[in-house]
C-alpha cells in the first residue's frame, strides 16, 4: 500500500508568450498521493471550470487558453492540494504578443496656413509599435515644425502650403507592420493681395486701368468697390493662373473716386478678406496745399468751443505759419459776418464753418483732415441758410469778403465726400440731425429723394474731391 505523499510540483510554470487569437498552454506537473485537486488562478482570481475560454486537462495539470485576447495578460498560478501537508503553488506570466494594429487612423484634414494640424494615429501592439509617417512616397522627416507625438499622432506647427499632400501612418514591431489608409492634408490660405491697385491723378475723360492681383487657397474672388458702393460702370477682366487671380478694372474718369479691390475666399463657414484701395483724382480738382499735412490736437480756441466735440482731435494745417492762430483768426472773421443772418441759419452755419475749418482728424498713420459730409453741407446751403447763402455768394463774387489770406472758409459742397458712399470718410454735424426735426417747411430747392440718415436732407449727385476747397461757389 502506497504511503501518503504531499504534492510536489515537478515542472514549475514558466513565462508563456502568445499571439492574440492563438493558443497558450501552461503545464503544472504534480507528484503526490493521493491524487491532488488542482485549481488555477489568473491574477489571484480563480478560473472557473466551466469558463469556455479555457480548457483544463490531464487531471487539471494542463491549462489551455483557446484563443488569446490582449486582456489575457497576467500572472497564472496552479495550486495543488491533496490533504497531505500544505497546498503548493507555482506561477508564471502570460505575455500577450500582438501585431501592430491602428485603432484610430488619421482622417482627411483641411487646415488654414499658419495654424497647427494634428493627424491622429493611435496604435495597439506588443511590443509597443513604433509609429512613423509617410508623405507621398517618402518617409516624413521630423523637424522644428513637424513631430510625431508619443501617441503616434503627427503634429505640424505653423502649417505651410508645402505641407499639403497625402499622408499615412506606419505602425511597426517585431511581429509585423500595419499601414493606415492614405489621408489628404489640404492647406487653405487666407486671401492676400499681391499687387494693389495704383492711385492715379488724371485729366477729366481719361481711361484708367486699375489692376489688383490676389492669391489664396481656394482661389479668391475679386470684387471692386467705388466710393463704398459696388462698381456700376467700367469693365472688369479676370484671369486665374496658379492660384493667383488677376483682375483689371477699366474706367472712364469723369469724377474722382476711391476704388477698393476686395479679395475673398471661403474656409468652411468663414470667409477671409483682403482689401487694397487706390484713389483716382482729377488733376484740376486737387487743392495745392502742403500735401494736406499738419498735426492733430484738441481745439484750444474760443470761437468754436461750444460747437466742436469736447474730446475730438482736430486737424491743424501747417500750410499756415502758426496753424492754431491762423485758423482761429479765419473763424473769428467768419463769425462776425454771421451776426446778421436769421436765427434758423446762424447755428447751422456756425456748425458748418467750425467743422470745416477745424476738421476732425482722420486716425490713419499720417494725420489728415476728415471733411464734412456733403449732405450736411447741402442741408446748410439749401435748407437752413438758402437765402443767406445766395446773398453771400453774390457778395463773394464782387470780392467783398476777400481778406489778406483767403476767402471766407465756406466749403464747396459738391466737392465733399458723400456719407452714403463711405460713412467713415466724412464728418457729420450733430446739430443738424437734431434741428431737422423742428423744420416743417422746406425750400423748393430741396431734393425730393430723402437721404438715408437725415430725412429730407438734400442728396446730391455731384462729384466729390479728396480735399475740400476754401471757396464759396
Amino acid at each position: 500500500e502506497k504511503l501518503p505523499k504531499a504534492p510536489v510540483i515537478t515542472t514549475p510554470l514558466e513565462t508563456v508568450d502568445a499571439l492574440v487569437e492563438e493558443v497558450a498552454t501552461f503545464m503544472c506537473a504534480v507528484e503526490s498521493y493521493p491524487q491532488p485537486e488542482i485549481s488555477w488562478t489568473r491574477n489571484k482570481i480563480l478560473i472557473k471550470l466551466f469558463d469556455t475560454r479555457y480548457s483544463i486537462r490531464e487531471n487539471g495539470q494542463l491549462l489551455t487558453i483557446l484563443s488569446v485576447e490582449d486582456s489575457d495578460d497576467g500572472i497564472y498560478c496552479c495550486i495543488a492540494n491533496n490533504g497531505v501537508g500544505g497546498a503548493v503553488e507555482s506561477c508564471g506570466a502570460l505575455q500577450v504578443k500582438m501585431k501592430p494594429k491602428i485603432t484610430r487612423p488619421p482622417i482627411n484634414v483641411k487646415i488654414i496656413e499658419g495654424l497647427k494640424a494634428v493627424l491622429p494615429c493611435t496604435t495597439m501592439g506588443n511590443p509597443k509599435p513604433s509609429v512613423s509617417w509617410i508623405k507621398g512616397d517618402n518617409a516624413l522627416r521630423e523637424n522644428s515644425r513637424i513631430a510625431v507625438l508619443e501617441s503616434g499622432s503627427l503634429r505640424i506647427h505653423n502649417v505651410q502650403k508645402e505641407d499639403a499632400g497625402q499622408y499615412r501612418c506606419v505602425a511597426k514591431n517585431s511581429l509585423g507592420t500595419a499601414y493606415s489608409k492614405l489621408v489628404k492634408l489640404e492647406v487653405e490660405v487666407f486671401a492676400r493681395i499681391l499687387r494693389a491697385p495704383e492711385s492715379h491723378n488724371v485729366t477729366f475723360g481719361s481711361f484708367v486701368t486699375l489692376r489688383c492681383t490676389a492669391i489664396g487657397i481656394p482661389v479668391p474672388t475679386i470684387s471692386w468697390i467705388e466710393n463704398g458702393n459696388a462698381v456700376s460702370s467700367g469693365s472688369i477682366q479676370e484671369s486665374v493662373k496658379d492660384r493667383v487671380i488677376d483682375s483689371r478694372l477699366q474706367l472712364f474718369i469723369t469724377k474722382p473716386g476711391l476704388y477698393t479691390c476686395i479679395a475673398t475666399n471661403k474656409h468652411g463657414e468663414k470667409f477671409s478678406t483682403a482689401k487694397a484701395a487706390a484713389t483716382v483724382s482729377i488733376a484740376e480738382w486737387s487743392k495745392s496745399q502742403k500735401d494736406s499735412q499738419g498735426y492733430c490736437a484738441q481745439y484750444r480756441g474760443e470761437v468754436c468751443d461750444a460747437v466742436l466735440a469736447k474730446d475730438a482731435l482736430v486737424f491743424f494745417n501747417t500750410s499756415y505759419r502758426d496753424p492754431e492762430d491762423a485758423q482761429e483768426l479765419l473763424i473769428h472773421t467768419a463769425w462776425n459776418e454771421l451776426k446778421a443772418v436769421s436765427p434758423l441759419c446762424r447755428p447751422a452755419a456756425e456748425a458748418l464753418l467750425c467743422n470745416h475749418l477745424f476738421q476732425e482728424c482722420s486716425p490713419g498713420v499720417v494725420p489728415t483732415p476728415m471733411p464734412i459730409c456733403r449732405e450736411y453741407c447741402l442741408a446748410v446751403k439749401e435748407l437752413f441758410c438758402a437765402k443767406e447763402w445766395q446773398a453771400m455768394e453774390g457778395k463773394a463774387h464782387r470780392g467783398l469778403y476777400r481778406s489778406g489770406m483767403h476767402l471766407l472758409p465756406v466749403p464747396e459742397c459738391s466737392k465733399l465726400p458723400s456719407m452714403h458712399r463711405d460713412p467713415t470718410a466724412c464728418t457729420r454735424l450733430p446739430y443738424l440731425d437734431y434741428k431737422k426735426e423742428n423744420i416743417t417747411t422746406f425750400p423748393s430747392i430741396t431734393s425730393s429723394r430723402p437721404s438715408a440718415d437725415i430725412p429730407n436732407l438734400p442728396a446730391s449727385t455731384s462729384s466729390f474731391a479728396v480735399s475740400p476747397a476754401y471757396s464759396m461757389t
Partner: antibody, heavy 121, light 107 residues
Framework: QVQVQESGPGLVKPSQTLSLTCTVS??????????WSWIRQPPGKGLEWMGV???????YYSPSLKSRTSISRDTSKNQFSLHLSSVTPDDTAVYYC?????????????WGQGTQVTVSS | SYELTQSPSVSVALRRTAKITCGGD??????TQWYQQKPGQAPVLVIY???RRPSGIPERFSGSNSGNTATLTISGAQAEDEADYYC??????????FGGGTHLTVL
C-alpha cells in the same frame, strides 16, 4: 506715459528669419491717432524706417525692404512684431520700435531702448 | 524713394548758434521732424511739423522749412546738445524717410 520695449534674439544666422516683438505699456496699440513703427540703425550708420502698423491693423513697408518685411500685432498682449526674412550680415543693427502720433504730425514721440541684432553664422 | 541729404558734421562754439540743414526735393511741401540721438541712446523728438517743439524741449531748439531745405537751429548751443541729429519726413505713400544724420560738435 506710454512705454515701448523690444525683445528678441540677439543673434540670427544668415538666410533665417529675424523676429522681434515690441511690448507696449501705458497705452493701447489700437488707440486712434497712433501708429507703431520699426526703425533700425546699422553700426555707425543712420536711422532706417522699416515699416508701420496703424491702429486698425493696416501695414505699410519701406519700399527697399517690402519683399522681406512683415509686421503683425497681437492686440490681446498689446504687442506688435517684426519679421524680416532671408537676413544677411547687412541686417546687423540696433532695432527700435517707436510710436507715431498724429498729435505731433506722425513724428515718433516714444522709442524703445533698442535691441542689438547680429546676423552671423 | 525720397532722398534727404544732411551734411555729416557741424561744429559750433559753446553758446553760439548752430544750423543743421536737411535737403530734399520740395521738402517745403512736407512736414519735417528732427530727432536728437546721443551715443548708446534712442533718438528723442526735438521738433515736429517743421517748427513745433514737444513739451520738455528747450526753447533754444527751433525749426523752419521752405523750398528744398529744412533747417534745425540751436540758438546758444550747450555742451549737452552735442549729439547726432536726424531729419525725417513722411511721403504721400505713407513711407517714412530719414536723413543720413549730422553730428553736432560743441567746441
Amino acid at each position: 506715459q506710454v512705454q515701448v520695449q523690444e525683445s528678441g534674439p540677439g543673434l540670427v544666422k544668415p538666410s533665417q528669419t529675424l523676429s522681434l516683438t515690441c511690448t507696449v505699456s501705458g497705452g493701447s496699440i489700437t488707440a486712434r491717432y497712433y501708429s507703431w513703427s520699426w526703425i533700425r540703425q546699422p553700426p555707425g550708420k543712420g536711422l532706417e524706417w522699416m515699416g508701420v502698423i496703424a491702429y486698425d491693423g493696416s501695414t505699410y513697408y519701406s519700399p527697399s525692404l517690402k519683399s522681406r518685411t512683415s509686421i503683425s500685432r497681437d492686440t490681446s498682449k498689446n504687442q506688435f512684431s517684426l519679421h524680416l526674412s532671408s537676413v544677411t550680415p547687412d541686417d546687423t543693427a540696433v532695432y527700435y520700435c517707436a510710436r507715431g502720433s498724429s498729435r505731433v504730425a506722425a513724428a515718433f514721440d516714444s522709442w524703445g531702448q533698442g535691441t542689438q541684432v547680429t546676423v552671423s553664422s | 524713394s525720397y532722398e534727404l541729404t544732411q551734411s555729416p558734421s557741424v561744429s559750433v562754439a559753446l553758446r553760439r548758434t548752430a544750423k543743421i540743414t536737411c535737403g530734399g526735393d520740395n521738402i517745403g511741401s512736407k512736414n519735417t521732424q528732427w530727432y536728437q540721438q546721443k551715443p548708446g541712446q534712442a533718438p528723442v523728438l526735438v521738433i515736429y511739423a517743421d517748427s513745433r517743439r514737444p513739451s520738455g524741449i528747450p526753447e533754444r531748439f527751433s525749426g523752419s522749412n521752405s523750398g528744398n531745405t529744412a533747417t534745425l537751429t540751436i540758438s546758444g548751443a550747450q555742451a549737452e546738445d552735442e549729439a547726432d541729429y536726424y531729419c525725417h519726413v513722411w511721403d504721400s505713400s505713407t513711407n517714412a524717410w530719414f536723413g543720413g544724420g549730422t553730428h553736432l560738435t560743441v567746441l
